[in-house]
Amino acid sequence: RVDRCSLQPCRNGGLCLDLGHALRCRCRAGFAGPRCEHDLDDCAGRACANGGTCVEGGGAHRCSCALGFGGRDCRERADPCAARPCAHGGRCYAHFSGLVCACAPGYMGARCEFPVHPDGASALPAAPPGLRPGDPQR
């Protein structure tokens, strides 16, 4: 008798059962369908380190890392200041409670976004036209 399960019809690690009249797939947690082809939970069994959270979607999964961590599983130390979160030349410092900007003279705000003297010039330095919020950072 031919072992029809040798053709490995079950996807994503599902267990093949030859019932004689038909084949059945017993799916692992997070998968469904006759051949376990549907990924119900992209994040099943995936761990993100250092407080990262698994983000599902599109048949793939990735970790969204907590501030200060990066890499595929959030195991790598990342510099949260590398994204340049302070405006107008402010200097970024990573603090245990979050980021801190030390503003250049003449600017204020958590991210140094506002001029100190409201009666001064009415325009801020122009934004570079090539950069759009949402575009990849250069």
Epitope: L67, A83, S97, A123, L124, P133, G134
Partner: antibody, heavy 124, light 113 residues
Framework: QEQLVESGGGLVQPGGSLKLSCKVS????????VSWVRQAPGKGLEWIGY????????YYASWVNGRFTISSHNAQNTLYLQLNSLTAADTATYFC?????????????????WGPGTLVTVSS | DVVMTQTPASVEAAVGGTVTINCQAS??????LSWYQQKPGQPPKLLIY???TLASGVPSRFKGSGSGTQFTLTISDLECADAATYYC???????????????FGGGTEVVVK
């Protein structure tokens, strides 16, 4: 793909409370914050407040007066808006919105990605 | 708090025409002025930020100008698809309370004939 999806809206009695959730994905909080904005049926947009998770700061419109609270959780992938002491005037669609704060050293403060919104109806 | 006064409340223009929407801030907001377009049943869409910079994918028919307290959105070569409500939005910072806040204008309905 940057995305924000609100949930938790529904019918609530006057004086009641509701907690709205906003699931976010696809962007880094070093450069972006998340704002809550509401819109009553047939009316304009009204800003409620915003959270800047990387800096641990939350700001509110003065009219909120402590009734609403914005918080974040779980490596900042889910944000919340707690609504308390609700009245009929709070009936609105509540939007969760990404705010481009400072990107690559340039300040923007524009709301560039909007969720579809969740409807809150306050009625007895 | 900053109050944003948007005028007119409604404006009608023909296809191919030009529409101008004004937004006045009650105090100096520098360049922190954004414009949004909203169509019925949809969330708003960012058109312009930092007074005059077009958001990704927005046609150059949309033009923002101004600074300080007076701002303008101009839509030229009007198309039927431009029929929508337009909102201005400011960001300002109160140094006394270390307080950053946003405010929206009341909206302008654009009707395209």
């Amino acid at each position: 793909q940057e995305q924000l999806v609100e949930s938790g809206g529904g019918l609530v009695q006057p004086g009641g409370s509701l907690k709205l959730s906003c699931k976010v994905s696809g962007f880094d909080f070093s450069n972006y914050g998340v704002s809550w904005v509401r819109q009553a049926p047939g009316k304009g947009l009204e800003w409620i407040g915003y959270i800047d998770p990387a800096f641990g700061r939350t700001y509110y419109a003065s009219w909120v007066n402590g009734r609403f609270t914005i918080s974040s959780h779980n490596a900042q992938n889910t944000l919340y808006l707690q609504l308390n002491s609700l009245t009929a005037a709070d009936t609105a669609t509540y939007f969760c919105v990404r705010v481009a704060l400072v990107v690559a050293g340039v300040a923007y403060y524009g709301m560039d990605v909007w969720g579809p919104g969740t409807l809150v109806t306050v009625s007895s | 708090d900053v109050v944003m006064t948007q005028t007119p409340a409604s404006v009608e223009a023909a296809v191919g025409g030009t529409v101008t929407i004004n937004c006045q801030a009650s105090q100096n907001i520098y360049s922190y002025l954004s414009w949004y377009q909203q169509k019925p049943g949809q969330p708003p869409k960012l058109l312009i930020y930092r007074t005059s910079t077009l958001a990704s994918g927005v046609p150059s028919r949309f033009k923002g100008s101004g600074s300080g307290t007076q701002f303008t959105l101009t839509i030229s070569d009007l198309e039927c698809a431009d029929a929508a409500t337009y909102y201005c939005q400011s960001y300002y910072y109160s140094s006394g309370s270390s307080y950053g806040a946003f405010a929206f204008g009341g909206g302008t309905e654009v009707v395209v004939k």
